[in-house]
């Protein structure tokens, strides 16, 4: 998985004679937006074939009004990158199609009018993870300057985003034949030689074709937890030493999807399901009509003659979503609950659960007091939908298993000295203060400023 990124630097009249002064017609102001379409392979594909690698639409650029007699300026462009997420391997060879659209804002009957100003199609070779590639293309009298790159979304790395990073087994070095995993130098490249389907999280291999399980996991593909109880409370983002290896916060935390979009996790990233009328990586693009070509993968656009009337995409077989942007696969039915990640192993589906959940479908909430073991006299406290251990003095951590210095939190106020004691802690107060934590000043007349009863 990864993201193809396109940065438009400039769009304007080309250098030759007869170049237009302005993208706008004489009828009034206009603004630009861009559409990018990616198709796999280097073969010349029909213009109407689906953008099988994905597509994206930019936001609208600033409004531009032609100034008579003024020199032709650089045209104002939409802000930001165009991003096209890809779920599978990056193919390396692809067709890049960039369309420049004009939105006329004059007094048209029925609202704004859209027209395609320029379309450039280029077949390219590009390795993921490489530097920005710069390009200048001409389409008719127009010139487009842009940069593009493909980058992998962790844990995927490599020129095709097919290799995976994993935490180091030893702090100092990677395993035999494995390199540090740029850009995460504290991680190592995972050898791509394990038995097919071997869990990326709970399994590893030292010889091709094997699948050896980390402590706490079993089964031919290391998918089966030996016991969930040993994992309780050890669910930080790096609980690798325990073998429980339940992920930490997920990419959907805080819901990155705008405009009412719903978030679902994908390997190493997230995917937004957008309400009709919105799309883009985070559902940030709106005001879309059929003229924008919002239906991907050969979907048929119906209605939506203007931004205020909704369009509907009729998707071809094998695609779904309000913009036909989602390939229907066996994970589309969302078998994994509580934000779990669905993995299609070929013979069956498996769920990779988020922190705090377990079970074949991530249906078990580990994060409740019924299942939480608070050690060393700690008590489980529920509140606000969360569960935590309130630890006895001298212990800390999520399960009160860690020895804690009661003085580490500097509990003694106003310069008091803290002493750890078998029964807890004792504060030796500085002159002029009293109380168990030296919190009360002693007035000169000997009366302390205790809070009112």
């Amino acid at each position: 998985a990864g993201v193809f990124e396109l940065q438009i630097h400039s769009f304007g009249p080309g250098p030759g004679p007869g170049a237009p002064r302005s993208p706008c017609s004489a009828r009034g102001p206009c603004r630009l937006f861009f559409r990018v379409c990616l198709k796999p392979g280097l073969s010349e594909e029909a213009a109407e074939s689906p953008c099988a690698l994905g597509a994206a639409l930019s936001a609208r650029g600033p409004v531009y009004t032609e100034q008579p007699e003024a020199p032709a300026p650089d045209l104002p462009l939409p802000n930001g990158l165009l991003q096209v997420p890809f779920r599978d391997a990056w193919p390396g060879t692809f067709s890049l199609i960039i369309e420049t659209w004009r939105e006329e804002l004059g007094d048209q009957i029925g609202g704004p009018a859209w027209s395609l100003l320029a379309r450039v199609t280029r077949r390219r070779r590009l390795a993921a993870g490489g530097p920005w590639a710069r390009d200048i293309q001409r389409a008719g009298a127009w010139e487009l300057r842009f940069s593009y790159r493909a980058r992998c979304e962790l844990p995927a790395v490599g020129t095709a985003c097919t290799r995976l990073c994993r935490p180091r087994s030893a702090p100092s070095r990677c395993g035999p034949g494995l390199r540090p995993c740029a850009p995460l130098e504290d991680e190592c490249e995972a050898p791509p030689v394990c038995r097919a389907g071997c869990s990326l999280e709970h399994g590893f291999c030292e010889q091709p074709g094997e699948c050896r399980c980390l402590e706490g996991w079993t089964g031919p593909l290391c998918m089966v937890p030996v016991s969930t109880s040993s994992c309780l409370g050890l669910r930080g983002p790096s609980s690798t030493t325990t073998g429980c290896l339940v992920p930490g916060p997920g990419p959907c935390d805080g819901n990155p999807c705008a405009n009412g979009g719903s978030c679902s996790e994908t390997p190493g990233s997230f995917e937004c399901t957008c309400p009709r009328g919105f799309y883009g990586l985070r559902c940030e693009v709106s005001g879309v009509t059929c003229a924008d070509g919002p239906c991907f993968n050969g979907g048929l656009c119906v209605g939506g003659a203007d931004p205020d009337s909704a369009y509907i995409c009729h998707c071809p077989p094998g695609f779904q979503g309000s913009n036909c942007e989602k390939r229907v696969d066996r994970c589309s039915l969302q078998p994994c609950r509580n934000g779990g990640l669905c993995l299609d192993l070929g013979h069956a589906l498996r769920c990779r659960c988020r922190a705090g959940f377990a079970g074949p479908r991530c249906e078990h909430d580990l994060d409740d007091c019924a299942g939480r073991a608070c050690a060393n006299g700690g008590t489980c406290v529920e509140g606000g939908g969360a569960h935590r251990c309130s630890c006895a003095l001298g212990f800390g951590g999520r399960n009160c298993r860690e020895r804690a210095d009661p003085c580490a939190a500097r509990p003694c106020a106003h310069g008091g000295r803290c002493y750890a004691h078998f029964s807890g802690l004792v504060c030796a107060c500085a002159p002029g203060y009293m109380g168990a934590r030296c919190e009360f000043p002693v007035h000169p007349d000997g009366v302390s400023a205790l809070p009112a009863a």
């Epitope: 094998g318 039915l333 069956a348 589906l349 769920c351």
Partner: antibody, heavy 120, light 107 residues
Framework: EVQLVQSGSELKKPGASVKVSCKAS????????MNWVRQAPGQGLEWMGI????????IYNHKFKGRFALSVDKSSNTAYLQISSLKAEDTAVYYC?????????????WGQGTTVTVSS | DIQMTQSPSSLSASVGDRVTITCHAS??????MGWLQQKPGKAPKGLIY???NLEDGVPSRFSGSGSGADYTLTISSLQPEDFADYYC?????????FGGGTKVEIK
């Protein structure tokens, strides 16, 4: 014992609607998808669509998009197939069939079938 | 869509015969297929899942084999109660698709 019990036969006029039910028992309803399969008289089996009872997410065979709607009622462990604007060619036996949601198994248990006859 | 081509469409056999039915998928389906039995006026019943695994309660005379795009259902010794229609179904990809069926009749 796993059982899928479907509603009785229906005789409808063209243009009417019908709602076929499939009541599940003997297993955790939300752990299994529900498939719907059509068999026209003297014909083979045709997959119509599938629903995840836990989330309500559906996937339809593109041939059955539009007039056909799948739904569930989790409180009664019942799946439904609704067909609107009935046509004569909708005359068939409709089956529900469960499938493990992690696809570890195929369609292992089937309802007894509901005959829907559309005739003026 | 994946096409499932089942053959033969019908066959006549005697009790005790060994019967083989094949199913060819239009693309590889990695064992994501099953075999169903349907008797007249009854609902289909699952026999085999994942190409080769017997559903609970299915007699061991039934067996499935195959990989990639080609799969076979074998009845090692046909019994009177085995005369029925048999269907293959793929669940590798939506929409699921069925074979056209094989009618096993008494010779």
């Amino acid at each position: 014992e796993v059982q899928l019990v479907q509603s009785g036969s229906e005789l409808k006029k063209p243009g009417a609607s019908v709602k076929v039910s499939c009541k599940a028992s003997g297993y955790t309803f939300t752990d299994y998808y529900m498939n719907w399969v059509r068999q026209a008289p003297g014909q083979g089996l045709e997959w119509m669509g599938i629903i995840n009872p836990y989330s309500g997410v559906t996937i339809y065979n593109h041939k059955f998009k539009g007039r056909f709607a799948l739904s569930v009622d989790k409180s009664s462990n019942t799946a439904y197939l609704q067909i609107s604007s009935l046509k004569a060619e909708d005359t068939a036996v409709y089956y529900c069939a469960r499938q493990d949601s992690l696809l570890d198994y195929a369609m292992d248990y089937w309802g007894q079938g509901t005959t829907v006859t559309v005739s003026s | 869509d994946i096409q499932m081509t089942q053959s033969p469409s019908s066959l006549s056999a005697s009790v005790g015969d060994r019967v083989t039915i094949t199913c060819h998928a239009s693309q590889g389906i990695s064992g994501n297929m099953g075999w169903l039995q349907q008797k007249p006026g009854k609902a289909p019943k699952g026999l085999i899942y994942h190409g080769a695994n017997l559903e609970d309660g299915v007699p061991s005379r039934f067996s499935g084999s195959g990989s990639g795009a080609d799969y076979t259902l074998t009845i090692s010794s046909l019994q009177p109660e085995d005369f029925a229609d048999y269907y293959c179904v793929q669940y590798a990809q939506f929409p699921y698709t069925f074979g056209g069926g094989t009618k096993v009749e008494i010779k």
